[in-house]
């Protein structure tokens, strides 16, 4: 069977006027997962995103992440898109320093 991922979007200050937004997926199985950033619904190119490897998290499930740098104040234009085992979801960038957690159920 499959285990859906927990998706968590965070933000951190990168440089003046810019922030790095990171989308993390954890506790999922199998390991194949799509995780990518969109701006105004359009996929960002590979050269503007950074990915972590898909790694085992010690519980028989996996974790990974994708990050991109954006202009502060434009957070609402960006969403993280996830596809896993026939399911999909989109996740907004949180305002301020809050985190967004979302678990998926089949």
């Amino acid at each position: 069977g499959s285990v859906p991922p927990m998706v968590n979007v965070t933000r951190s200050e990168a440089s003046e006027g810019n922030i790095t937004v990171t989308c993390r997926a954890s506790s999922f199985y199998p390991r194949n997962i799509t995780l990518t950033w969109r701006q105004d619904g359009v996929s960002l190119s590979h050269d503007t995103q950074q990915w972590g490897d898909v790694l085992p998290d010690g519980n028989g499930t996996y974790q990974t992440w994708v990050a991109t740098r954006i202009c502060q104040g434009e957070e609402q234009r960006f969403t993280c898109y996830m596809e896993h085992s026939g399911n999909h979801s989109t996740h907004p960038v949180p305002s301020g320093n809050s985190h967004h957690h979302h678990h998926h159920h089949h």
Epitope: L35, W51, E83, N87, T90
Partner: antibody, heavy 120, light 107 residues
Framework: QVQLKESGPGLVAPSQSLSITCTVS????????VNWVRQPPGKGLEWLGM???????DYNSALKSRLSISKDNSKSQIFLKMNSLQTDDTARYYC??????????????WGAGTTVTVSS | DIQMTQTTSSLSASLGDRVTISCSAS??????LNWYQQKPDGTVKLLIY???SLHSGVPSRFSGSGSGTDYSLTISNLEPEDIATYYC?????????FGGGTKVEIK
Amino acid sequence: QVQLKESGPGLVAPSQSLSITCTVSGFSLTGSGVNWVRQPPGKGLEWLGMIWGDGNTDYNSALKSRLSISKDNSKSQIFLKMNSLQTDDTARYYCARGAYYGKRWYFDVWGAGTTVTVSS
Amino acid sequence: DIQMTQTTSSLSASLGDRVTISCSASQGISNYLNWYQQKPDGTVKLLIYYTSSLHSGVPSRFSGSGSGTDYSLTISNLEPEDIATYYCQQYSKLPPTFGGGTKVEIK
């Protein structure tokens, strides 16, 4: 096994629109992206656009104004519509499943293609 | 758009030969490169993804390498079924773009 099959009109008159259907089996459209690629006679391959599992679309900006990609998950079908065809749109049109895993994005299974000729 | 150039449009080689097909990008593409094989009947198959990863079911005589702007596909021991046109494709920037293709024929 995973299969994709294109079906199109064969012949289209200039200035008319083109509709092609890609019927897939062996995988779910809700969890995979499908791409459209074309190849004019004797030339190379050109990516037209794609539709994601959630129905979101990305297009080649050079053709975006004439292109529309949609799908029907329940029928396992993806649709390509292109408007205002000219003779240089004559090509073999392929649909291909996209695999997008972090640093890896590739078209792992292709249909056989359908030939479209634009002529009066 | 990123231009992908395959300078050799066709080549002839003998069965058993080692064949190398080159591809260059108009700017660095960070190994975001795939290789496809198109048979004379138009059938397209994925061979190599992310520069050097062999797709499942593809014979091990196929290999890929490269970095920056320059990439290559090598067939270590040419077989009759390798008669085809080979295309490189970048996905560093949207839209994904393909090289013009290299047709491999038997001498």
